[in-house]
Interface confidence: low
């Protein structure tokens, strides 16, 4: 007898993993044998669609390799012309292990800005996303949050946020890990320790110290009165992202010294500055404070002037007396730029013997000042014109007073060799006798204020007499 179709096993919800096989069964009893058709989301599945296999007279629908897009409602309809067509429907739920569709990438960011590391995922059930920093799970806080999308957002990035990150997508079917990415936090250059201002004596050594940090580690440059530092030695060291720069200066003039720390962020630079002033206290002459020691002269400037292996007084008010006094001679000499050939050797002799004074060793090493007569000989005979010009400039403030005090002693304050021949030092390079004074060109029309011929003659001392003086 003809029998209308009855579906004996209604379709059920089928869970299937991507790339696996999924089968719907639609068992039908009827006579004659029915025609069975299948739809997905109300669209007919064609018999020749190679993605499907329809068997058992149409009662089995097999999806040969499930895709994410196969999700939907599947219905079978049976009709044999007896009675009406019957239908049963079931859902295909495509289950999917987590998959990271937009993984995080390396990020460089400036401290204080917002960083977002993407991590977009797919999966069914929907994966939960967490993040690992280094080897540890990342804890969210007021600054750090995992967004709905799975991306990691860090507000007000701090340098401690730098490191290696990876995202983890997890559902009941499995876990997916992104590759490890690097968050680099760049930090604007910042000065941690600024140079400090100093008030020092002329000719002192001063070390200005500037410490800066930043990521990348900044470079430090020094500016002196608005220009690149022209003299002085710079020592730098870098440790734990801190750069330490020390500028050692030999102070001959006041100045404003600026430490500039610079680092680069992409195409842009950040800088931090700090300044220190160096001012010069009133120069006190070395004789006033006889703290020092005797040592053989080992410098260069005064080699030709001082006796070979001369024992000179080195003033310990300087950090490095030898170098400081040597530089003082250089500096003082440069202040007296244009001098005549007659004056030059005499002035050099005076200068060298004034700065590198002869030293009397003993329990307390003592500097021996130049004898007044020799000082006056330079002032009123060899360098009369130059001396006048220099004194005039000093009075008009064109020379700094400390330079004046430094480069030329005040003759009147020096001991006379007639008081105590051992209390003062001679200038052997000023070898001449009074008979030969006329061989020198007249230097001034004014009468010398001292009886220069009172200098010892060859008959009265060991001071050699010659119309010439050799200085190279």
């Amino acid at each position: 007898l003809p029998k209308a179709p009855v579906i004996t096993t209604p379709l059920e919800t089928v869970d299937a993993l991507v790339e696996e096989v999924a089968t719907f069964m639609c068992a039908v009893e009827s006579y004659p044998q029915p025609e069975i058709s299948w739809t997905r989301n109300k669209i007919l599945i064609k018999l020749f669609d190679t993605r499907y296999s329809i068997r058992e007279n149409g009662q089995l629908l097999t999806i040969l390799s499930v895709e994410d897009s196969d999700d939907g409602i599947y219905c079978c309809t049976a009709n044999n012309g007896v009675g009406g067509a019957v239908e049963s429907c079931g859902a295909l739920q495509v289950k999917m292990k987590p998959k990271i569709t937009r993984p995080p990438i390396n990020v460089k960011i400036i401290e204080g800005l917002k960083a977002v590391l993407p991590c977009t995922t797919m999966g069914n059930p929907k994966p939960s996303v967490s993040w690992i920093k280094g080897d540890s799970p990342l804890r969210e806080n007021s600054r750090i949050a995992v967004l709905e999308s799975g991306s990691l957002r860090i507000h007000n990035v701090q340098k401690e946020d730098a490191g290696q990150y990876r995202c983890v997508a997890k559902n009941s079917l499995g876990t997916a890990y992104s590759k490890v990415v690097k968050l680099e936090v760049e930090v604007f250059a910042r000065i941690l320790r600024a140079p400090e201002s100093h008030n020092v004596t002329f000719g002192s050594f001063v070390t200005l110290h500037c410490t800066a940090t930043g990521i990348p580690v900044p470079t430090i440059t020094w500016i002196e009165n608005g220009n690149a530092v022209s003299s002085g030695s710079i020592q730098e060291s870098v440790k734990d992202r801190v750069i330490d720069s020390r500028l050692q200066l030999f102070i001959t003039k006041p100045g404003l010294y600026t430490c500039i720390a610079t680092n680069k962020h992409g195409e842009k630079f950040s800088t931090a500055k700090a300044a220190a002033t160096i001012s010069i206290a009133e120069w006190s002459k070395p004789q006033k404070d006889n703290k020092g020691y005797c040592a053989q002269y080992r410098g260069e400037v005064c080699n030709a002037v001082l006796a070979k292996d001369a024992l000179v007084f080195l003033n310990t008010s300087y950090a490095d007396p030898e170098e400081a006094q040597e530089l003082l001679v250089h500096t003082a000499w440069n202040e007296l730029k244009v001098v005549s050939p007659v004056c030059r050797p005499a002035a050099e002799a005076l200068l060298c013997n004034h700065i590198f004074q002869e030293c009397s060793p003993g329990v307390v090493p003592t500097p021996i000042p130049i004898c007044r007569e020799y000082c006056l000989a330079v002032k009123e005979l060899f360098c009369a014109k130059e001396w006048l010009v220099m004194e005039e400039k000093t009075h008009r403030g064109l020379y700094r007073s400390e330079m004046h005090l430094l480069s030329v002693p005040e003759c009147s304050k020096l001991p006379s060799m007639h008081w105590d021949p051992t209390a003062c030092a001679r200038l052997p390079h000023l070898d001449y006798n009074k008979e030969n004074l006329k061989t020198f060109p007249p230097m001034t029309s004014s009468k010398p204020s001292v009886d220069i011929p009172n200098l010892p003659s060859s008959s009265s001392s060991s001071f050699s007499v010659s119309p010439t003086y050799s200085m190279t």
Partner: antibody, heavy 121, light 112 residues
Framework: ELQLVESGGGLVQPGGSLRLSCAAS????????MSWVRQAPGKGLEWVSA????????YYKESVKGRFTISRDNAKKTLYLQMNSLKSEDTAVYYC??????????????WGQGTLVTVSS | QAVVTQEPSLSVSPGGTVTLTCGLS?????????PDWYQQTPGQAPRTLIY???SRHSGVPSRFSGSISGNKAALTITGAQPEDEADYYC????????????FGGGTKLTVL
């Protein structure tokens, strides 16, 4: 959130000693110089002492030199002020303050709430 | 030893402008003194307003500005608000040695 919390204040007799502590949080402690500033009751602020980021040098107001010692423990994120031979004129609220680090003795850009030191017999 | 000087008290009307100054008993204030300004309301810890002459600390309203004028450092409040009534201290960096950082005696500002 940046925080500086002072402790260790109290009543002490003249000639006595106290050690103040300042616990820092919310910033990279070893990146910054620190200072102690005090304020006598009803009076103005007075800088007492400073220490740079690495503790490499220390600075003091003339009147406390030789009696007070500033120090820091970067691992513990703590600043200290050891006060010996206390005098009645040291009575004040002592503030711990973070230096900006940009210049020597730069601006004190964060302050604690202070701890009261009373020197009295 | 140099003393940092400030006006003991000043007053300003709400919305008005007032300038507080900070000088040295001997000599001029220069940028090398890195003038800093602090505000303190009764019972509270001080708060940083201006550092290094003219840099405003984070969170400080733009009505506060710093400068060096003549031989003094100056703090100007443009458009004073009632909440600006407080004690204001300037501090100067005095260079090496002791008493490196010196506060002024403070100015009591009243907003009438």
């Amino acid at each position: 959130e940046l925080q500086l919390v002072e402790s260790g204040g109290g009543l002490v007799q003249p000639g006595g000693s106290l050690r103040l502590s300042c616990a820092a949080s919310g910033f990279t402690f070893d990146d910054y110089g620190m200072s102690w500033v005090r304020q006598a009751p009803g009076k103005g602020l007075e800088w007492v002492s400073a220490i740079p980021w690495n503790g490499g040098s220390t600075y003091y107001k003339e009147s406390v030199k030789g009696r007070f010692t500033i120090s820091r423990d970067n691992a513990k994120k703590t600043l200290y002020l050891q006060m010996n031979s206390l005098k009645s004129e040291d009575t004040a609220v002592y503030y711990c303050a973070k230096r900006s680090g940009r210049i020597a003795f730069g601006a004190l850009d964060a302050w604690g709430q202070g701890t009261l030191v009373t020197v009295s017999s | 030893q140099a003393v940092v000087t400030q006006e003991p008290s000043l007053s300003v009307s709400p919305g008005g402008t007032v300038t507080l100054t900070c000088g040295l008993s001997s000599g001029s204030v220069t940028s090398s003194n890195y003038p800093d300004w602090y505000q303190q309301t009764p019972g509270q810890a001080p708060r940083t307003l201006i550092y290094t002459t003219n840099s405003r600390h984070s969170g400080v309203p733009s009505r506060f500005s710093g400068s060096i004028s003549g031989n003094k450092a100056a703090l100007t409040i443009t458009g004073a608000q009632p909440e600006d009534e407080a004690d204001y201290y300037c501090a100067l960096y005095m260079g090496g040695g002791s008493n490196v950082y010196v506060f002024g005696g403070g100015t009591k500002l009243t907003v009438l």
